[in-house]
Structures are given as C-alpha cells and as structure tokens.
C-alpha cells in the first residue's frame, strides 16, 4: 500500500503520501482552534504509471491509453485513499470544546 | 455537479469532465472486443480552486492551504466521481459473449 509506512521510509518517485505540516494560523488563517497549533496533514504526489496502485477499471484503461499516447493530457492522478480524523480543542465563549474533525489526515494514496 | 450535462455544455476552465473517445484497437491495442469499436470514456481535467466541488474536509483544507501558499505542490486533483459500466461483445471461440465492464465511463468529476 502507498501508505505512510512505505512512503515515508522510501525515495519513491511515483504516487505516494508525502509529509506536509499545516499550521492552522499561518497556513489557513484559522485562529479559532486552540489545540493543536497545527498538524501533519500530509498530501499525495507523484506520477501514476501503468499500473501503479490503480483504483478502478477506468484508471487502468486510462493508464494504458496514456502509455500508448504519452502526450495525452488524460492521465490518472495521485489522490488520498485512507483519511483519518483529527481531534481539536476550541472555545465557545470560555468553555473548551473537543471535536473530531473527520477526514483530515492522509494515511495513504491511490491513482484515480 | 461537475457532470457531462454541465461540463459538455460549458467552457468551464476548472475541474470538469472532458470528452475523450477511446478506440480499442488504435488506442489500447485491443483486437478482442467485437462491439463496440470504441467508446466515450471521458476524463477529468482542470484546477481545483477553493472551494470547487471539494470531496472531503481534507480537500477543503488543502485547497485553502494552496490559496495561502500558491507555490506549494500540495493541491487537490480533479478525478472521477461517478463511473458507469460499458457493455461489450467479444468471442470465446465462435461463441459471442456479452459482458458489462464495470467503472469504464466517467460521468462526473470531483476535487480530491
């Protein structure tokens, strides 16, 4: 699987999950989250050569098409597969609230 | 929705489904499919600005991150959302067979 275990410990050039830290205030302009100050969101990057972790029948056909038509702009793209939630603390008035923000952290990628 | 109804009738520059006809023999090197000779597979293309048909919380965060960090290589990507099957006819010996190939036609796209 193109997950953090494999991708973070290899020099993989093809589609893989990459490290990305997002600072809520600096990168998103969000002041309302009290904790954490930021988080390891990660992101997906890299080409999707034939048959690199392809998602569907369509992406196999498209990758095959791309193999035979290298100049074509139609190609599979490296996108998140498994996402995880992020627990945050924010305030409503003076009252702290704990919330799980769903689908916030990329754990693995796929070619779609 | 970024579907064929909207995308084929507009000059949308952002993520949208685009027309792509695949000829089985010319584009894939397949001689074994008797009918059809090819099909309108379509493909997804276009930038994913904030907040253009974003798929998950994560893709919203990433698009916002991209807005604040325009030079970053981390950005949502335009990929298939709704896929449809394609019925084909092929021969096993002299016997014609009809098969539904699942997930072969892109009907709509999303930013993931």
């Amino acid at each position: 699987a193109l997950d953090t275990n494999y991708c973070f410990s290899s020099t993989e050039k093809n589609c893989c999950v990459r490290q990305l830290y997002i600072d809520f205030r600096k990168d998103l302009g969000w002041k309302w989250i009290h904790e954490p100050k930021g988080y390891h969101a990660n992101f997906c990057l890299g080409p999707c050569p034939y048959i690199w972790s392809l998602d569907t029948q369509y992406s196999k056909v498209l990758a095959l098409y791309n193999q035979h038509n290298p100049g074509a702009s139609a190609a599979p793209c490296c996108v998140p597969q498994a996402l995880e939630p992020l627990p945050i603390v924010y305030y409503v008035g003076r009252k702290p609230k704990v919330e799980q923000l769903s689908n916030m952290i990329v754990r693995s990628c796929k070619c779609s | 929705a970024l579907d064929t109804n909207y995308c084929f009738s507009s000059t949308e520059k952002n993520c949208c489904v685009r027309q792509l006809y695949i000829d089985f023999r010319k584009d894939l090197g397949w001689k074994w499919i008797h009918e059809p000779k090819g099909y309108h597979a379509n493909f997804c293309l276009g930038p994913c600005p904030y907040i253009w048909s974003l798929d998950t919380q994560y893709s919203k965060v990433l698009a916002l991150y991209n807005q604040h960090n325009p030079g970053a290589s981390a950005a949502p990507c335009c990929v298939p959302q709704a896929l449809e099957p394609l019925p084909i006819v092929y021969y096993v010996g002299r016997k014609p067979k009809v098969e539904q190939l699942s997930n072969m036609i892109v009907r709509s796209c999303k930013c993931s």
Epitope: I51, Q57, K60, L64, H68 | R25, L28, G29, W30, K31, W32, Y90, V92, K97, E99, L101, S102
Partner: nanobody, 114 residues
C-alpha cells in the same frame, strides 16, 4: 480461473542475458493485457513491459535492453533481457488482466551481480 507460472530466473553477471517465460493455463479470453512486473526488496511492484494484442510498452529503465513477446496460440509470454545491470535485480512477476481482473504468477528471482 487463470494460472500463471514463470521460469528462467537465475544469477547472472552484469552485461549478460536471461530469458524469462510465463505459461498461462485455464480459460484465456478477454485479455486486457499481459505483462512483466518486478519487485525489488522494500519497493513497490513496478511495470517492466506490457503487451496488448498488437502493442508493446516498456518502462524507461529497460527500453532498448528488454523485449517482450507473446504467443497467443501457446498462451505464453516471454521477456528477453539483455545487457543486464545490478539494478535489474528483483523478483519478476508475470501478470494477466482478464476483463479487468489481475492474475499473477508466483514470481521468479533474477539476480545480477559480479
């Protein structure tokens, strides 16, 4: 159900040649492609070469050195590997995609070392 068996792997010196063979058994029809893939230790499985009915395609790293050939009558696939390099060391797998379903052989080890 399709079964694939590879043969022809072994230990060779840099610059030498090897020929891998793959035999497919079972009901072979509706073939999207047949191909050779390889997996080096700690790496993902990667395409080496693929063959559709009348088209072949190669990974950049093997172009000009490797040749894929297919005999549909005998349901066999071959990979002629010339000018082998140490970086070609991997387990080589035969693959057949039938109507969208992938079938794999158990693999054959190729080691290129002096």
């Amino acid at each position: 159900q399709v079964q694939l068996v590879e043969s022809g792997g072994g230990l060779v010196q840099p610059g030498e040649s090897l020929r891998l063979s793959c035999t497919a058994s079972g009901s072979i029809f509706g073939v999207f492609y047949m191909g050779w893939f390889r997996q080096a230790p700690g790496k993902q499985r990667d395409m080496v070469a693929i063959s559709t009915d009348d088209r072949t395609s190669y990974a950049d790293s093997v172009k000009g050195r490797f040749t894929i050939s297919r005999d549909n009558a005998k349901n066999t696939l071959a990979l002629q590997m010339n000018s082998l390099k140490p970086e070609d060391t991997a387990v080589y797998f035969c693959n057949l995609n039938q109507l969208g379903t992938d079938y794999w052989g158990p693999g054959t080890q190729v080691t290129v070392s002096s």
